[in-house]
């Protein structure tokens, strides 16, 4: 059993449940955003393909002191099989493009919703 959901989860859950909860957390962030998210911090854009959960975490983990995305960071760690630390990058990053965290979250949310609708939970 995989403890998907990381520290945000009360215990092991099915992949579909973990993905559902991640989507809801991202919806939460986009709905509750008033001031610029994470003070307008910029992060590396990623390829929304295989391995994107680790890539998303590698990108977002470099944003510090932003409580709004801390839960998302913890949840993403549950989807990534290896430990991710700040400054770590994989080949999945589009290293020539930086975007605002708010846009990164919106793009990720749209893609995850698509995966969920299509039944791609793993």
């Amino acid at each position: 059993l995989t403890c998907l959901g990381g520290f945000a989860s009360p215990g092991p859950v099915p992949p579909s449940t973990a993905l559902r909860e991640l989507i809801e957390e991202l919806v939460n962030i986009t709905q509750n955003q008033k001031a610029p998210l994470c003070n307008g911090s910029m992060v590396w854009s990623i390829n929304l393909t295989a391995g994107m959960y680790c890539a998303a975490l590698e990108s977002l983990i470099n944003v510090s002191g932003c409580s709004a995305i801390e839960k998302t960071q913890r949840m993403l760690s549950g989807f990534c099989p290896h430990k991710v630390s700040a400054g770590q990058f994989s080949s999945l990053h589009v290293r020539d493009t930086k975007i605002e965290v708010a846009q990164f979250v919106k793009d990720l949310l749209l893609h995850l919703k698509k995966l969920f609708r299509e039944g791609q939970f793993n």
Epitope: L1, G5, S9, P10, V13, P14, P15, S16, T17, R20, E21, I23, E24, V27, N28, Q31, F116, G119, F121
Partner: antibody, heavy 118, light 107 residues
Framework: EVQLQESGPGLVKPSETLSLTCTVS????????WNWIRKPPGKKLEYMGY???????YYNPSLKSQITISRDTSKNQLSLKLSSVTAADTAVYYC????????????WGQGTTVTVSS | DIQMNQSPSSLSASVGDRVTITCHAS??????LSWYQQKPGKLPKLLIY???DLHTGVPSRFSGSGSGTDFTLTISSLQPEDFATYYC?????????FGGGTKVEIK
């Protein structure tokens, strides 16, 4: 104690829109997931979809073009709309709660019978 | 979609009997299975989740087992209030799907 109560017309004409309401008491629809499930006569229970505490929705792909789930937070109600109904949509319709981080339905409504017939 | 097949579709038993109902998933669902009980004209009630965890307030005569594709609901000593229809449901992936039900009748 959270309780769910479905309501709506018991008879709907073919090609019309079926509209049902689920009233939640003892809890808030701004927490957890609120689902619609139906049981056609002689068939299996069929999962229809949910509306989340955020208002986000998921629909069973088999019903995607037909179904809309919405909510009214001021009335603590969720609603189901099913367009262009046929006799195959005749069923007992249930609303049910699914808590965050779970995949099972811990609270159900009594169900309401809807017959599609002219 | 994951198909859930329950057997038998109905059974007759007496008070005190040990009753076993099985549920088969068309693919591996790990332990993400729940069981429900429904009496005529009543709402479905959650009995068991995660294949073997008893929901709050459910009598200990009910038990669940299994993982992967094959699961069992057992009533160790059937009581008069247990005559009902029982359903399994998978929570591995959306859309969630149910078994066809097993009606437990009085012999």
């Amino acid at each position: 104690e959270v309780q769910l109560q479905e309501s709506g017309p018991g008879l709907v004409k073919p090609s019309e829109t079926l509209s049902l309401t689920c009233t939640v008491s003892g809890g808030s629809i701004t927490s957890d997931y609120w689902n619609w499930i139906r049981k056609p006569p002689g068939k299996k229970l069929e999962y229809m979809g949910y509306i989340s505490y955020n208002g986000n929705t998921y629909y069973n792909p088999s019903l995607k073009s037909q179904i809309t789930i919405s909510r009214d937070t001021s009335k603590n109600q969720l609603s189901l709309k099913l367009s262009s109904v046929t006799a195959a949509d005749t069923a007992v319709y249930y609303c049910a709660r699914l808590a965050k981080w779970t995949w099972y339905f811990d609270i159900w409504g009594q169900g309401t019978t809807v017959t599609v017939s002219s | 979609d994951i198909q859930m097949n329950q057997s038998p579709s109905s059974l007759s038993a007496s008070v005190g009997d040990r009753v076993t109902i099985t549920c088969h998933a068309s693919q591996n669902i790990n332990v993400w299975l729940s069981w429900y009980q429904q009496k005529p004209g009543k709402l479905p009630k959650l009995l068991i989740y995660k294949a073997s965890d008893l929901h709050t307030g459910v009598p200990s005569r009910f038990s669940g087992s299994g993982s992967g594709t094959d699961f069992t609901l057992t009533i160790s000593s059937l009581q008069p209030e247990d005559f009902a229809t029982y359903y399994c449901q998978q929570g591995q992936s959306y859309p969630y799907t149910f078994g066809g039900g097993t009606k437990v009748e009085i012999k």
